[in-house]
């Protein structure tokens, strides 16, 4: 059995409020901000996590400009609207009635507009490229060891099916992890690559979402793998729709 039953906590999401008020006195956890019930045996959706993050006290964050060729998660925090399943609603608006369309990982994929803006569907992000630079080590990591450890990390820690880790590339000190997951490939119960990438990003930044104070402990053959830079690129099934003005800015 899990600690959630003993202590009534959520192993996979520390941004929850838990109480033994479920069926049969079982522990039930709800996400901060939205109050939605979460399944603590798997990852919580990025939308609910962002909503919880915005409901908590926070420091001002510096924004990073997106790349002109791909959508980049620039950590531009906002309080998102989530659907009943915890996914991002296709259209997001702020308090001043400025609206925009987002993809399945919540990254803006259109110019900003007003309340008349239409976002017909939530466009799926089917390919995520995680670009890391590790801190200097005595020597390069063995590529096959690194590949195996990162695949195992995504399978065990993030519960992502191995078939969705398409490739691990390594040219010291750069590591690239490719995640691919088409709509047709994702079965019920499968972790979404966007959620896995978000948990990984927060882990790498030392802001683990998992319960407990341990944080991520990543090693390759006993050697700590410490990351000093992370960039995440998102590719959607349908290309984003930005005006030429933005593309030439």
């Amino acid at each position: 059995h899990t600690a959630a039953q003993d202590n009534c906590t959520c192993p996979t999401n520390k941004m929850t409020v838990c109480s033994p008020d479920g069926p049969g006195g079982r522990c039930q956890c709800r996400a901060l901000g939205s109050g939605m019930a979460v399944d603590c045996s798997t990852l919580t959706s990025k939308c609910l996590l962002l909503k919880a993050r915005m409901s908590a006290p926070k420091n001002a964050r510096t924004l990073v400009r997106p790349s002109e060729h791909a959508l980049v998660d620039n950590d531009g925090l906002y309080d998102p609207d989530c659907d009943p399943e915890g996914r991002f609603k296709a259209r997001q608006c702020n308090q001043t009635s400025v609206c925009w369309c987002v993809n399945s990982v919540g990254v803006r994929r259109t110019d900003k507009g007003d309340l008349s803006l239409r976002c017909d569907e939530l466009v799926r992000t089917h390919h995520i490229l995680i670009d890391l630079r590790h801190r200097p080590t005595a020597g390069a990591f063995n590529h096959s060891d690194l590949d195996a450890e990162l695949r195992r990390l995504f399978r065990e820690r993030y519960r992502l099916h191995p078939k969705f880790v398409a490739a691990v590339h390594y040219e010291q000190p750069t590591i690239q992890i490719e995640l691919r997951q088409n709509t047709s490939q994702k079965a019920a119960g499968d972790v979404d690559i966007g959620d896995a990438a978000y948990y990984f990003e927060r882990d790498i930044k030392g802001e683990s979402l998992f319960q407990g104070r341990g944080g991520l402990d990543l090693r390759v053959r006993g050697e700590p793998l410490q990351v000093e830079r992370t960039l995440i690129y998102y590719l959607d099934e349908i290309p984003p729709k930005f005006s030429m003005k933005r593309l030439t800015a």
């Epitope: 996979t12 065990e156 319960q211 402990d217 006993g222």
Partner: nanobody, 125 residues
């Protein structure tokens, strides 16, 4: 279904030794940080020892340092606690616990996700 099953508890005289085992099923054992906790009669559950998932780091409560040794055999999916020079105050139900994969270790019960049912160790003459 994840299961942790402790064994090896029993009655032992002061100064004696016991070796506790914790067998895991349903986990890829060598990615989980592991720990032993104990709960003396009428008291709170307390930390005893932990070991990182990679096996490179161990940590002990001051009360057991130099007497207890935590170890793991990844090929057998088993965690051990070798207890020497046992004292009456070591009497407790001993629990093994597993943290979330690739997490660092911790000394609090909330740092661990999966728990066994416990095995009773009684130190008495």
């Amino acid at each position: 279904q994840v299961q942790l099953l402790e064994s090896g508890g029993g009655l032992v005289q002061p100064g004696g030794s016991l070796r506790l085992s914790c067998a895991l099923s349903g986990l890829t054992f060598n990615t989980y940080p592991m720990a032993w906790f104990r709960q003396p009669p009428g008291q709170e559950r307390e930390f005893v020892a932990d070991m990182s998932w990679s096996g490179t780091n161990t940590y002990y409560a001051d009360s057991v340092k130099g007497r207890f040794t935590i170890s793991r055999d990844n090929s057998k999916n088993t965690l051990y606690l070798q207890m020497n020079s046992l004292r009456a105050e070591d009497t407790a139900v001993y629990y093994c616990a597993a943290g979330w994969p690739y997490s660092g270790t911790g000394r609090s019960t909330t740092d661990y996700t999966y728990w066994g049912q416990g095995t009773l160790v009684t130190v008495s003459s």
